[in-house]
Interface confidence: medium
Amino acid sequence: SNQPPGGGGGSGGDCPGGKGKSINCSELNVRESDVRVCDESSCKYGGVCKEDGDGLKCACQFQCHTNYIPVCGSNGDTYQNECFLRRAACKHQKEITVIARGPCYSDNGSGSGEGEEEGSGAEVHRKHSKCGPCKYKAECDEDAENVGCVCNIDCSGYSFNPVCASDGSSYNNPCFVREASCIKQEQIDIRHLGHCTDTDDTSLLGKKDDGLQYRPDVKDASDQREDVYIGNHMPCPENLNGYCIHGKCEFIYSTQKASCRCESGYTGQHCEKTDFSILYVVPSRQKLTHV
């Protein structure tokens, strides 16, 4: 992994996690009833919910080949291949979509080899006696007069590679999105490469991440394609890369809408849900952990 100094791994999981393989996350998907049910909400993004002694574990059993076919994730990280990206999404239980084929940016030292091995972008530094929790790669400066979370992300050496972020702003490089996320202490994701244009759906861009992903006005987006398709189905525009998590994106010409043809074992509008058929019953007050 070749993360830049202080350069953060982008927005990660919803819970603090170290660099190890499991994330202990007590507040995640805990049900108050005596019956613990493994369903699509308790273990997402391709994870398999398993009984493990006293509790449940969300196993991310991805056997990823090591071929370098880089993809750029919506969290600003470059992954070795799409499998590693999916594994990271599973591991952090956080939606990460492919926004572009190839690395997010190609300067030396400006991408992360595997992304998730650097720790979640939402990693909370527990040293927060004065600051409160510092997230998104911020660190607590207890010696400062105005005590607070300090961001040491340095984007000064980064090249021009504009991106459109979930806050509706266009940034000069994915690094600046991570910097803004750190400074504002709020989650800001990359929606797509290239600056935000007038065809972007501002109702989605202007919100903090609420599980929705960037979906532009597809009709306008399709108008910019050079190819003309006579049939009813055509490939989705480039700016919908990653619209379908585990499936193929198709643009239905007659309705001017994008839809997903899901891979086997996945459902949902974006093929983001695993089709669970096994229920696990475990004692109450047990914690669900993710591995």
């Epitope: 190839g102 940016y105 190609s106 300067d107 984007c155 050496g157 980064y158 090249s159 021009f160 590679n161 504009p162 702003s169 266009s170 940034y171 000069n172 600046f176 910097e179 803004a180 290239g194 600056h195 935000c196 244009t197 007038d198 910019q224």
Partner: antibody, heavy 124, light 107 residues
């Protein structure tokens, strides 16, 4: 001093090729997107092509697509425009220009530094 | 491609005048518009980017406004050095396009 200097222009016959160069100095060339813009005699400005800083992403005007190729050598701080199958209507002053990267986090756009231009005349 | 239409094509004015040049886009381009000044035999010079942001070193008498499809460049008090041709340019889509230009000449 930030400087862009074009070269390689001249008189060429229709159907022939020409390669323009743009030497950059005074700034970190590899960090910037770069454009070629042309201006026919007595006419307005016409955008020709752009190349992103890493050289991977390129876009062309419809009028030159398939005939012109934009490229760059970051180690030499040089931008290129390979022009094939030249036509009379390609006669113009060709400028290279730098994408307005700005000093902050946010995307600005526009072209903030221009060369002095090099003249290409396509004539039989 | 997005078409950019400038008006007027030619504008006659005197030193001290307030002048306005209009640029209209064939479809909405948000605020992704730049204005340039060009003098004969010289390269263009960036004046305004992102519709209303003044480029560093450009006199404050130049200002830009508008969003969507209608944009204006205003020179609050014309100076002798301002007589030139002005171009608008959109960069909403990855096919940058310029307006046809407005020649500002001495009345």
């Amino acid at each position: 001093q930030v400087l862009l200097v074009e070269s390689g222009g001249g008189v060429v016959q229709p159907g022939r090729s020409l390669r323009l160069s743009c030497a950059a100095s005074g700034f970190t060339f590899k960090r910037y997107g770069m454009h070629w813009v042309r201006q026919a005699p007595g006419r307005g400005l016409e955008w020709v092509a752009v190349i992103w800083s890493d050289g991977n992403k390129k876009h062309y005007a419809d009028s030159v697509k398939g005939r012109f190729t934009i490229s760059r050598d970051n180690s030499k701080n040089t931008l290129y425009l390979q022009m094939n199958s030249l036509r009379a209507e390609d006669t113009a002053v060709y400028y290279c220009a730098r994408e307005n990267y700005g000093s902050g986090s946010y995307y600005n756009g526009g072209m903030d530094v221009w060369g002095q231009g090099t003249t290409v005349t396509v004539s039989s | 491609d997005i078409q950019m239409t400038q008006s007027p094509s030619t504008l006659s004015a005197s030193v001290g005048d307030r002048v306005t040049i209009t640029c209209r886009a064939s479809q909405s381009i948000s605020s992704w518009l730049a204005w340039y000044q060009q003098k004969p035999g010289k390269a263009p010079k960036l004046l305004i980017y992102k519709a209303s942001s003044l480029e560093s070193g450009v006199p404050s008498r130049f200002s830009g406004s508008g969003s969507g499809t209608e944009f204006t460049l205003t020179i609050s008090s014309l100076q002798p050095d301002d007589f030139a041709t002005y171009y608008c340019q959109q960069y909403n889509s990855y096919s940058w396009t310029f307006g046809q230009g407005t020649k500002l000449e001495i009345k």
